[in-house]
């Protein structure tokens, strides 16, 4: 969490912004919050980039503007028009690329006086894995799939009852380059499972970490999948 | 409901520049995308460029060089002009606009003129 | 720039049939995804916005689906008034680009 004050001017107000990532081709929010003004028209919103010249977006007077806007943000941002007046100065950004990484200043004014707070923004791809039994083949054999990962994750098999065990002698993991060249899809098989047994395959970058956990029993399978973003910190 | 209608000479001469304006009636022009498209006679839709109602402009890289689309708000209108043209910028060209939530160009384009066409010859 | 493609360029229907119209995106583009259609000598008509959001007023025989890089439009029951050219255009990011458009024609 980034707490921002006014350095400035008839006096500072706060602004509180959160460290987040991005998942590329998705849509990502650049949080950032701050101390309500009464008019929306005296409430100035203004993103920047370190390392831009032009602004990632403006807001004043009640409405977008947008005339200094740097072309690579053009037709890609917006604010939360309706919740400005509630202190909610967030960006959705559409598309979210690499190059969108960096860190971003949320600058704010209204009539009480002036706040920025900075945001380290992480680009990457991150998605769900499944695990499935794999009845292709020759022994029991499990399958985590995640079509997207970006930078290329760690993968990590671990068992309910043999905690704390080293699968990597029985395992084997791939990654493979999509389409668009950047991202890859995760593919690892755990060889030689065990019947009434979880396991779980965890996919892990500095990003984000995700895990999918899969239950085999004689009657049924049973799958749970979550995800979690790292360092989401607030400032 | 909001209308747009284009207007602009139905010919012009190979290399000069081709003016088009279109007026937008029975809405607000500020806080939307404005956009122009054309279509060249038996083909299909091609972007053009759009303009945000406070004057920030992203054009089709294949057209930027002779593309300029400006804004006045006080008459309601956004323009298109594209320079140095040529037979093959005979076309018909619509302009629109863009919808969205919170006023990004997200929805398609919603409202769009009738169209008008323009020809290039000598 | 990215690319759209659309398949078929031509298909012959006869009234009531369910059609489909395939756009294909060179990149992901999440939902961002338009549909519209163009009658001869007309402006286009948007019917679906972001991939599956019917345009308001437009007949609920008209559907749109999926993400990423593969889309389709549905007709669920061909009308008369249904034939015409459908052309599917990407809003991700700038340049917004259109697909080479679909003329659906009486069999």
């Known amino acids: 969490l980034i707490i921002g004050f006014g350095i400035s001017g008839r006096h500072s107000i706060t602004v509180t912004t959160v460290a987040s990532a991005g998942n590329i081709g998705e849509d990502g929010i650049l949080s950032c919050t701050f101390e309500p003004d009464i008019k929306l028209s005296d409430i100035v919103i203004q993103w920047l980039k370190e390392g831009v010249l032009g602004l990632v977006h403006e807001f004043k007077e009640g409405k977008d503007e947008l005339s200094e806007q740097d072309e690579m943000f053009r037709g890609r941002t917006a604010v939360f028009a309706d919740q400005v007046i509630v202190g909610n100065a967030s960006l959705r950004l559409k598309n979210v690329q690499l190059t969108d990484a960096g860190t971003y200043k949320c600058y704010i004014i209204t009539s009480k006086g002036k706040g920025n707070a900075n945001l380290e923004y992480k680009t990457g791809a991150f998605s769900m894995p499944e695990v499935n039994v794999d009845y292709n083949a020759s022994s029991e054999t499990l399958r985590c799939e995640a079509p997207r990962w970006f930078p290329q994750p760690t993968v990590v098999w671990a068992s309910q009852v043999d905690q704390g065990a080293n699968f990597s002698e029985v395992s084997n993991t791939s990654f493979e380059l999509n389409s668009e060249n950047v991202t890859m899809k995760v593919v690892s098989v755990l060889y030689n499972v065990t019947i009434n047994n979880t396991y779980s395959c965890m996919i892990e970058n500095d990003i984000a970490k995700a895990t999918g956990d899969i239950k085999v029993t004689e009657s049924e399978i049973k799958r749970r999948s979550h995800l979690q973003l790292l360092n989401s910190k607030a400032s | 409901q909001v209308q747009l209608q284009e207007s602009g000479p139905g010919l012009v001469k190979p290399s000069e520049t081709l003016s088009l304006t279109c007026t937008v009636s029975?809405?607000?022009?500020?806080?939307?995308?404005w956009g122009w498209i054309r279509q060249p006679p038996g083909k299909g839709l091609e972007w053009i460029g759009y303009i945000y109602s406070s004057g920030s402009t992203s054009y089709n890289p294949s057209l930027k060089s002779r593309v300029t689309i400006s804004v006045d708000t006080s008459k309601n209108q956004f323009s298109l002009k594209l320079s140095s043209v040529t037979a093959a910028d005979t076309a018909v060209y619509y302009c629109a606009r863009g919808s969205g939530l919170y006023a990004a160009p997200d929805y398609g384009l919603d409202v769009w003129g009738q169209g008008t066409t323009v020809t290039v010859s000598s | 720039d990215i690319q759209m493609t659309q398949s078929p360029s031509t298909l012959s229907a006869s009234v009531g049939d369910r059609v489909t119209i395939t756009c294909r995106a060179s990149q992901s583009i999440s939902s961002w995804l338009a549909w519209y259609q163009q009658k001869p000598g007309k402006a286009p008509k948007l019917l679906i916005y972001?991939?599956?959001s019917l345009e308001s007023g437009v007949p609920s025989r008209f559907s749109g689906s999926g993400s990423g890089t593969e889309f389709t439009l549905t007709i669920s029951s061909l009308q008369p008034d249904d034939f015409a050219t459908y052309y599917c255009q990407q809003d991700n990011s700038f340049p917004f680009t259109f697909g080479g458009g679909t003329k659906v024609e009486i069999k």
């Open positions: 029975g809405g607000s022009i500020i806080s939307y995308y």
């Open positions: 972001k991939a599956s």
